[in-house]
């Protein structure tokens, strides 16, 4: 037995362009939380797999609210060691998954919502004892800086934890070549079981020290293949100098016990010992259940009908996944129609319509031209959601509440000059050129003549509407 | 402003089915889980059941055999049904919200006082 | 299921006064998934606190959750006459969701 202990350093935004200035959303202060999950082997596993060596989660950290102008320092992080207790053996290679959540403070309906900002994954090797590890660890654009170890929990020590401290009430009570049990100076070390070093898979020991070989395996830690003929004919314990054993068939034997179980065997049977998270004769059901706190982001566990059966999680709205660990982007399914805006609130979607355009998915058009006048004799047009006036000539903008200088564009080609006039304009061209525009030139042998001014109009006189 | 207006018979004869109807105003019935509660006169608060519009229920163990929640999300109703009372079913029965960041009751209705009784 | 003991059962106090308030879970409670409420004569439940510390909207700071894992406390720093009322504790970690027995602060 013994505890998994994970200090975070720093977490912030890495280095580059483009890191984030804040952990929080736009919505107001937040506050950071961390959950560490330990998984056994290392196999890439599923991430809704359980935690089968275990889980713990962090306090909350103080609550962050973004300076605008000020750079992104490390956050605001929960005091304390998160501490993860093992009760069996440790098992070595482990995947360590780190998750930092993000808990917003704002103006929610209902409380607070969480969400998951980063996770790290990594697999790693570890022996139990040793010093602190430390590590660095980018997620997106945040950077995560951490350190870890295994430590024994007495009596037991070891690298795996498995070799157990005995009291003793005089020095001469530790064997020969026994240290003290460290930190505790009246304990003493258990004797190794086997040589240091002996293969755990193809070795074995009857007395403290020795490493005798399983049938195809030689060498002083059982490490080398050996030829079977050095074997053969022998039953039981060998005297011979290999060390050479072919046991008889014991109920361990292949190793009966799924999921990272260990098999001891029992007088014509066998017994597993199953890591957290798993329990039946062979460790072959997952045993974590709602005691585990299995589901996040305030999800309530739901049990099965009966104590064998898996746990689910009913996830509140906004979050799914086994563990209600995913956030939905209910926004990705475009549920505002005719171009309008969606907005996720965490406790409802909200639509944002464009012009002309209402309901709670702006579904519902408008009659853009309802109560709306268009001036000075213009007509009102639908469409795209807005109303458009279509104005009588002479009339622009909006509502045709503006006059327009029908010259002002310049209409009268090859120099004609243009004369506003209550049906329009009247262009007067110059020589060598006709049309209502003056657009085309008059035939060298054709007459042309400069139009007389229509009446009550002189060439450069302010337009005047009838 | 949300708020939850729960309506049906004040008194139902025991071996019938008690039927509750809950109406909510200010808030869609399709955003949220709903739940009934109900509290015996001068005792404590009883958890129901809940629901959700896509017809995700959970039931208290305790009544699970007799109750029956569903939503008509149309009407933004949510109802409740209890078959078989008895006399020890006689409560006040409330209507409420579910919170977004947890299984927690953020609004009630004013409640219904509902009596078993021949 | 998870059962709720709160206590005391009848809190007798004066305007002014310190009130704590214990609800004690018969398992652990993860991730503090923890709410109390109040509750007056003829009104329903209002809630007040959830995640064992946090105050909901528009509950005033004279009203303080803390407490982890099976201990939980619901403090009233100084109780104003119309906090006089029946207090519930509810957990909502896990199915089913459980309430508390209550707890009544009246007027000594």
């Known amino acids: 037995a013994g505890v998994f202990e994970l200090q975070i350093h720093s977490f912030g935004p890495g280095p580059g362009p483009g890191a984030p200035r804040s952990p929080c959303s736009a919505r107001g202060p937040c506050r950071l939380f961390f959950r560490v999950c330990l998984k056994p082997g290392l196999s890439e596993e599923a991430a809704e797999s359980p935690c089968a060596l275990g889980a713990a989660l962090s306090a909350r950290g103080p609550v962050y609210t973004e300076q605008p102008e000020a750079p992104a320092p490390d956050l605001p992080l929960p005091n304390g060691l998160l501490q993860v207790p093992f009760r069996d053996a440790w098992p070595g290679t482990f995947s360590l998954i780190i998750e930092t959540w993000r808990e917003e403070l704002g103006d929610q309906i209902g409380g607070p919502a969480w969400s998951l900002l980063a996770r790290v994954t990594r697999r790693r090797r570890l022996a139990a004892g040793g010093p602190w590890a430390r590590d660095i660890q980018r997620a997106g654009a945040w950077e995560l800086r951490f350190s870890y170890r295994a430590r024994c929990e007495l009596p037991a020590v070891g690298t795996a934890c498995t070799r157990l401290c005995r009291p003793r009430s005089a020095p001469s009570r530790c064997g020969p070549g026994l240290r003290p049990c460290a930190p505790l100076e009246d304990e003493c070390e258990a004797p190794p079981v086997c040589r240091a070093g002996c293969s755990l898979e193809h070795g074995f020991c009857e007395q403290p020290g020795e490493c005798r070989c399983l049938e195809g395996w030689t060498g002083p830690l059982c490490m080398v293949p050996a030829s079977t003929s050095s074997c053969l004919g022998l039953r039981g314990p060998s005297s011979a100098t290999t060390g050479c054993l072919v046991p008889g068939p014991g109920p361990c034997d292949g190793n009966p016990c799924a999921n990272g179980g260990s098999c001891s065997e029992t007088p014509g049977s066998f017994e597993c010992t199953c890591p957290r998270g798993f329990y039946g004769l062979r460790c072959e059901v997952s045993g974590v259940t709602c005691a585990d706190g299995p589901c996040f982001n305030g999800g309530l566990c739901v049990g099965g009908a009966d104590p064998d059966s898996a746990y689910i999680c009913h996830c509140p709205p906004g979050f799914q996944g086994s563990n209600c660990e995913k956030r939905v982007d209910r926004c990705s399914l475009q549920p505002c129609r005719n171009g309008g805006l969606c907005l996720d609130l965490g406790h409802a979607l909200r639509c944002r319509c464009r012009a002309g355009f209402a309901g709670p998915r702006c579904e519902h058009n408008l009659d853009d031209c309802a109560g709306r006048a268009c001036a000075n004799g213009g007509t009102c047009v639908e469409g795209g959601g807005a109303h458009r006036c279509s104005c009588a000539l002479g009339f622009g903008g909006r509502d045709c509440r503006e006059r327009a200088d029908p010259c002002a564009a310049r209409p009268c080609a090859h120099g004609g000059r243009c004369y506003a006039h209550f049906s329009g304009l009247v262009c007067a061209c110059a020589p060598g050129y006709m049309g209502s525009r003056c657009e085309f030139p008059v035939h060298p042998d054709g007459v042309s003549a400069l139009p007389a001014a229509p009446p009550g109009l002189r060439p450069g006189d302010p337009q005047r509407y009838l | 402003q949300v708020q939850l207006q729960e309506w049906g018979p004040g008194l139902v004869k025991p071996s019938e089915t008690l039927s509750l109807t809950c109406t909510v105003s200010g808030a869609s019935i399709s955003s949220f889980y709903w739940s009934w509660i109900r509290q015996p006169p001068g005792k404590g608060l009883e958890w129901i059941g809940y629901i959700y519009y896509s017809g995700t229920t959970n039931y208290n163990p305790s009544l699970k055999s007799r109750v029956t929640i569903s939503v008509d999300t149309s009407k933004n109703q949510l109802s409740l049904k209890l078959s078989s009372v008895t006399a020890a079913d006689t409560a006040v029965y409330y209507c409420?919200?579910?919170?977004?960041?947890?299984?927690?009751?953020?609004?009630w209705g004013q409640g219904t006082l509902v009596t078993v009784s021949s | 299921e998870i059962v709720l003991t709160q206590s005391p059962g009848t809190l007798s106090l004066s305007p002014g006064e310190r009130a704590t308030l214990s609800c004690r879970a018969s398992q652990s409670v993860n991730k503090n998934y923890l709410a109390w409420y109040q509750q007056k004569p003829g009104q329903a439940p209002r809630l007040l606190i959830y995640?064992?510390?946090s105050r909901a909207t528009g509950i005033p700071d004279r009203f303080s959750g803390s407490g982890s894992g099976t201990d939980f406390t619901l403090t009233i720093s100084r109780l104003e006459p119309e906090d006089f009322a029946v207090y519930y504790c509810q957990q909502y970690d896990r199915s089913p969701l459980t309430f508390g027995g209550g707890t009544k602060v009246d007027i000594k």
């Open positions: 409420a919200r579910i919170a977004v960041a947890g299984f927690f009751f953020d609004y």
């Open positions: 995640g064992a510390s």
